[in-house]
């Protein structure tokens, strides 16, 4: 039994780090493998993560952590019974993938403005809470070419756009994702999308 693709890990900078790897053949990850992780810190203990299958030869493990700070470093040991398959380390602050924003809502009752709001996925005491910026994706269900991205570079989890920038009388969907420049993170997953029917009063034309 050998590791084909070494574990790579990302942290949500809150309570979970996710490690993925591939074995050289079909593997029952949860029965055959264990990923041990230990914070490099005085009097810490090793903790065990039981991996799940992620495709035939792929494994994924969700490492539970109390919290994360920038100084943290973890040792990782991948075991198959008594055999050490791989040894490595992981610094969560250098491999951050933020949590996806939630509760995306489209408010259509603000005159002819669309107000999109969503929730910051972090509690106020988390470092990332005040460091997230967002990308909002809006697309038409009827027209695949009608696809746009709005970059929200301010901290407030909201976006206002004129309803008239979208076509009237058709349905749109929106989703949002987050990233943090301070830790050069990857983008989060997209939030679940939300749907609304776009309609607005055409301005009265004088001839």
């Amino acid at each position: 039994m050998k590791v084909l693709q070494e574990p790579t890990c990302v942290s949500d900078y809150m309570s979970i780090s996710t490690c993925e790897w591939k074995m050289n053949g079909p593997t029952n990850c949860s029965t055959e493998l264990r990923l041990l992780y230990q914070l490099v810190f005085l009097l810490s203990e090793a903790h065990t993560c039981i991996p799940e299958n992620n495709g035939g030869a792929g494994c994924v493990c969700h490492l539970l952590m109390d919290d994360v700070v920038s100084a943290d470093n973890y040792t990782l040991d991948l075991w198959a019974g008594q055999q050490l398959l791989w040894k490595g380390s992981f610094k969560p602050s250098e491999h951050v993938k933020p949590r996806a924003p939630g509760n995306l809502t489209v408010h259509t009752n603000v005159s002819d403005t669309l107000l999109l709001t969503w929730s910051n996925p972090y509690p106020p005491d988390n470092y990332l809470y005040n460091h997230l910026t967002y990308a909002v994706n809006i697309w038409s269900e009827n027209d695949p070419a009608d696809f746009r991205i709005y970059n929200v570079t301010y901290l407030e989890p909201s976006l206002r756009i004129a309803a008239s920038t979208l076509k009237s009388g058709i349905s749109y969907r929106a989703r949002v994702r987050a990233w943090a420049q301070c830790y050069n993170t990857t983008w989060s997953e997209w939030s679940p999308s939300t749907k609304w029917h776009n309609s607005y009063r055409e301005p009265f034309e004088q001839h």
Epitope: F41, L42, S44, M65, Y127
Partner: antibody
Framework: EVQLVESGGGLEQPGGSLRLSCAGS????????MTWVRQAPGKGLEWVSS????????YYADSVKGRFTISRDNSKNTLYLQMNSLRAEDTAVYYC??????????????????WGQGTTVTVSS | DIVMTQSPLSLPVTPGEPASISCRSS???????????VDWYLQKSGQSPQLLIY???KRASGVPDRFSGSGSGTDFTLKISRVEAEDVGFYYC?????????FGQGTKLEIK
Amino acid sequence: EVQLVESGGGLEQPGGSLRLSCAGSGFTFRDFAMTWVRQAPGKGLEWVSSISGSGGNIYYADSVKGRFTISRDNSKNTLYLQMNSLRAEDTAVYYCAKDRLSVTVRPRYYGLDVWGQGTTVTVSS
Amino acid sequence: DIVMTQSPLSLPVTPGEPASISCRSSQSLLYSIGKNYVDWYLQKSGQSPQLLIYEGNKRASGVPDRFSGSGSGTDFTLKISRVEAEDVGFYYCMQSLTSPYTFGQGTKLEIK
């Protein structure tokens, strides 16, 4: 009441051995790291050794490395310090202390918040 | 090893007056925001040490609020707002960030 009680001190000749014990009560012993600290007559405090809750992580002061062994029996809620090749400079009062909560991924530190009454070790010919 | 240096080594104080003890470490004891791994202990004559302050500024359970800790990085201070007769003894700072744990030399607080 959270309590630590040391025993096993005494008079021993240079080169001899002693085994100190520290019995814990009033807290979940296995969840906490434990530490030994000593104090030579008229001197300040000196850290000796520490052990994590499971016993899997151990540290020693250079002055005792290779001579002293820290261990624990969580089923008996007891911490030990096996002292071999004793020297005159090991003469001191030895204290055990409750250290950080080490079962969490990040050990949670609240200081050495409980100390035993101390046991005296005298090394002399 | 991290060296902990206390001053003064002797501190005569009048009851009711404030007192301050300084502790300087040879390396930063700041691990993360607000977490400095430095403690303060008091050892009264003939007794075991007792914890006063941990993580630089957190008062241990049962410690009177006249005791406070401050500082970050390498410079730390223990303050007693109004010294009482029962506060006499030796005060020690200790770092617990890395092995070996190291103590300051101790400050003897006595009543004038």
